[in-house]
């Protein structure tokens, strides 16, 4: 079994991207919910 690297100087960039995507999708869901609620 190969070991994991102890150092990755760019992994945080992907994590940041995932967090942005998550935030964006939450924002979009909240907006969709607002539109549905407003139309009731």
């Amino acid at each position: 079994d190969n070991p994991s690297l102890s150092i990755d100087l760019t992994f945080h960039l992907l994590r940041t991207l995932l967090e942005l995507a998550r935030t964006q999708s939450q924002r979009e869901r909240a907006e969709q919910n607002r539109i549905i609620f407003d139309s009731v």
């Epitope: 079994d1 190969n2 070991p3 994991s4 690297l5 150092i7 990755d8 100087l9 760019t10 992994f11 945080h12 960039l13 992907l14 940041t16 991207l17 995932l18």
Partner: antibody, heavy 113, light 112 residues
Framework: EVQLQQSGPELVKPGVSMKISCKAS????????MNWVKQSHGKNLEWIGL????????IYNQKFKGKATLTVHKSSSTAYMELLSLTSEDSAVYYC??????WGQGTLVTVSA | DVVMTQTPLSLPVSLGDQASISCRSS???????????LHWYLQKPGQSPELLIY???NRFSGVPDRFSGSGSGTDFTLKISRVEAEDLGVYFC?????????FGAGTKLELK
């Protein structure tokens, strides 16, 4: 020991596309990012982008979008960079760099008619 | 894009001298996670760049303790306490805080 073995030098004609490979060994390939870097004129370094082998997630330098495509083949622990529609401006040495820490030996690409 | 400005571009030294290279970034390299992703590489003639110092001041495995890094925010320094023949080559600073990652133009450490 971490090793990144890149494919050999290429002499290609303008307009064609080509793929460079980077075979990784000595560590768990799917655990860390693979970066690609261009070095032209023996000095100037430019980051092309990165890929995470586990999920295929990529981040590109806007400058290289449409020029480079990054992929991986998990079962052979190999990363690939395809360079599209080559011009003389693409003549350079290209490096893969795992985690931006361990670098391959470089692949010289020469674009000439 | 973050511009990395290295000085000097050429640094003539004698063996045993102390050498110092400066790197300035056009914006802060402090990431929201608390890390500063400023790194130093050495490229010897005909070879690939090799990592010396990562995240400002951490020596990479196998790097001699005559190499040290310091700085914060936008202002960083690499010091070599006693230059040896194997240290000659081109030194690059680089940042991986912001996309796209960027490099300095390089500092050539050469003999006087």
């Amino acid at each position: 020991e971490v090793q990144l073995q890149q494919s050999g030098p290429e002499l290609v004609k303008p307009g064609v596309s080509m793929k460079i490979s980077c075979k990784a060994s000595g560590y768990s390939f799917t655990d860390s990012t693979m970066n690609w870097v261009k070095q032209s004129h023996g000095k100037n370094l430019e980051w092309i982008g990165l890929i995470h082998p586990d999920n295929g997630g990529t981040i590109y330098n806007q400058k290289f979008k449409g020029k480079a495509t990054l992929t991986v083949h998990k079962s052979s622990s190999t990363a690939y960079m395809e360079l599209l529609s080559l011009t003389s401006e693409d003549s350079a040495v290209y490096y893969c760099a795992n985690g931006f820490a361990y670098w391959g030996q470089g692949t010289l690409v020469t674009v000439s008619a | 894009d973050v511009v990395m400005t290295q000085t000097p571009l050429s640094l003539p030294v004698s063996l045993g001298d102390q050498a110092s290279i400066s790197c300035r970034s056009s914006q802060s390299l402090l990431h929201s996670n608390g890390n500063t992703y400023l790194h130093w590489y050495l490229q010897k003639p005909g070879q690939s760049p090799e990592l010396l110092i990562y995240k400002v001041s951490n020596r990479f495995s196998g790097v001699p303790d005559r190499f040290s890094g310091s700085g914060s925010g936008t202002d960083f320094t690499l010091k070599i306490s006693r230059v040896e023949a194997e240290d000659l080559g081109v030194y690059f600073c680089s940042q991986s805080t912001h996309v796209p990652l960027t490099f300095g133009a390089g500092t050539k450490l050469e003999l006087k």
